[in-house]
Amino acid sequence: NKILVKQSPMLVAYDNAVNLSCKYSYNLFSREFRASLHKGLDSAVEVCVVYGNYSQQLQVYSKTGFNCDGKLGNESVTFYLQNLYVNQTDIYFCKIEVMYPPPYLDNEKSNGTIIHVKGKHLCPSPLFPGPSKP
């Protein structure tokens, strides 16, 4: 038995930050689970981990140097990624593992979300600024 995951097909990170919501066909309330976000077609880079254990405080960490945070809903985990670089534009996959109660469950591979990171475009200052107001 596999958990199904739904993700937005594409998101644009305008300010080098993005919220990616992973929606599951499973209620995470009162479960011990490990939700993770993976980068690349082969999911080679684990971007962020959200660990939940019953009523305890959610734990969020990245083993790969990403700046991430996470929020938990009954059937979703939202990853908030900050300080993304343009070259981190890629496809990102949500993964969920439920360790307790048994049996161990994980998800069918989702379609993923393409995150397109748009760099900060600073407006050039005008060549001839008008008179400044007092």
Epitope: R34, E46, V49, Y51, Q56, Q57, Q59, V60, Y61, K63, T64, G65, E97, V98, M99, Y100, P102, Y104, D106
Partner: antibody
Framework: QVQLQQWGAGLLKPSETLSLICAVY????????WSWIRQPPGKGLEWIGD???????NFNPSLKSRVTISVDTSKNQFSLKLSSVTAADTAVYYC?????????WGQGIMVTVSS | EIVMTQSPATLSVSPGERATLSCRAS??????LDWYQQKPGQAPRLLIY???TRATGIPARFSGSGSGTEFTLTISSLQSEDFAVYYC?????????FGGGTKVEIK
């Protein structure tokens, strides 16, 4: 209640390969990461690396070139190999459940490297 | 890698008194910090994770606080079984790193 039992050779000569096994009893093996940590005599703790049931691994860069961690899900066991050991690798080696915090721990094995 | 510094190296406290142990990170680790207790000849035991969440079975006299770079483990009333070495460990950046430990001894 998860318990970890570890075993392996306690006395090695320089350049040999350290080999330890940790068995997990009384709890789920899948979904968790399983770690190795060491502690030289009278000193602090050093994280070596970890593995999950799928064989995904993470290593301390200071040891990565010499470390192999593998898993046998049929036996709920994971193992550590450390090649080309020197006296600086003399330590108590612990296995533990977890990837970010560790609970519980194995009993530890004192590994001495001496010619 | 992140360097974890614990102080003091040794803390002398009388039974029943409060003990306050400090841990400082060389850069922010948010709230991703653990505390462990280790007695001679034994493996470490997890006390606190997430800077303030007590692990299963840990008495309420142990409490953790702090975030960013400054953290504190407080033992509100020291019992005889609490005399041990205490380590902090961060998990905000890999590799995971531990502090050098604080030995809590009987005054």
């Amino acid at each position: 209640q998860v318990q970890l039992q570890q075993w392996g050779a306690g006395l090695l000569k320089p350049s040999e390969t350290l080999s330890l096994i940790c068995a997990v009893y009384g709890g789920s093996f899948s979904g968790y990461y399983w770690s190795w940590i060491r502690q030289p005599p009278g000193k602090g703790l050093e994280w070596i690396g970890d593995i999950n049931h799928s064989g995904n691994t993470n290593f301390n860069p200071s040891l990565k070139s010499r470390v192999t961690i593998s898993v046998d899900t049929s036996k709920n066991q994971f193992s550590l190999k450390l090649s080309s050991v020197t006296a600086a690798d003399t330590a108590v080696y612990y296995c533990a459940k977890g990837e970010a915090w560790f609970d519980p721990w194995g009993q530890g094995i004192m590994v001495t490297v001496s010619s | 890698e992140i360097v974890m510094t614990q102080s003091p190296a040794t803390l002398s406290v009388s039974p029943g008194e409060r003990a306050t142990l400090s841990c400082r990170a060389s850069q922010s680790v948010r709230s991703n910090l653990d505390w462990y207790q280790q007695k001679p000849g034994q493996a470490p035991r997890l006390l606190i994770y997430g800077a303030s969440t007590r692990a299963t079975g840990i008495p309420a006299r142990f409490s953790g606080s702090g975030s960013g770079t400054e953290f504190t483990l407080t033992i509100s009333s020291l019992q005889s079984e609490d005399f041990a070495v205490y380590y902090c460990q961060q998990y905000n950046n890999w590799p995971l790193t531990f502090g050098g430990g604080t030995k809590v001894e009987i005054k």
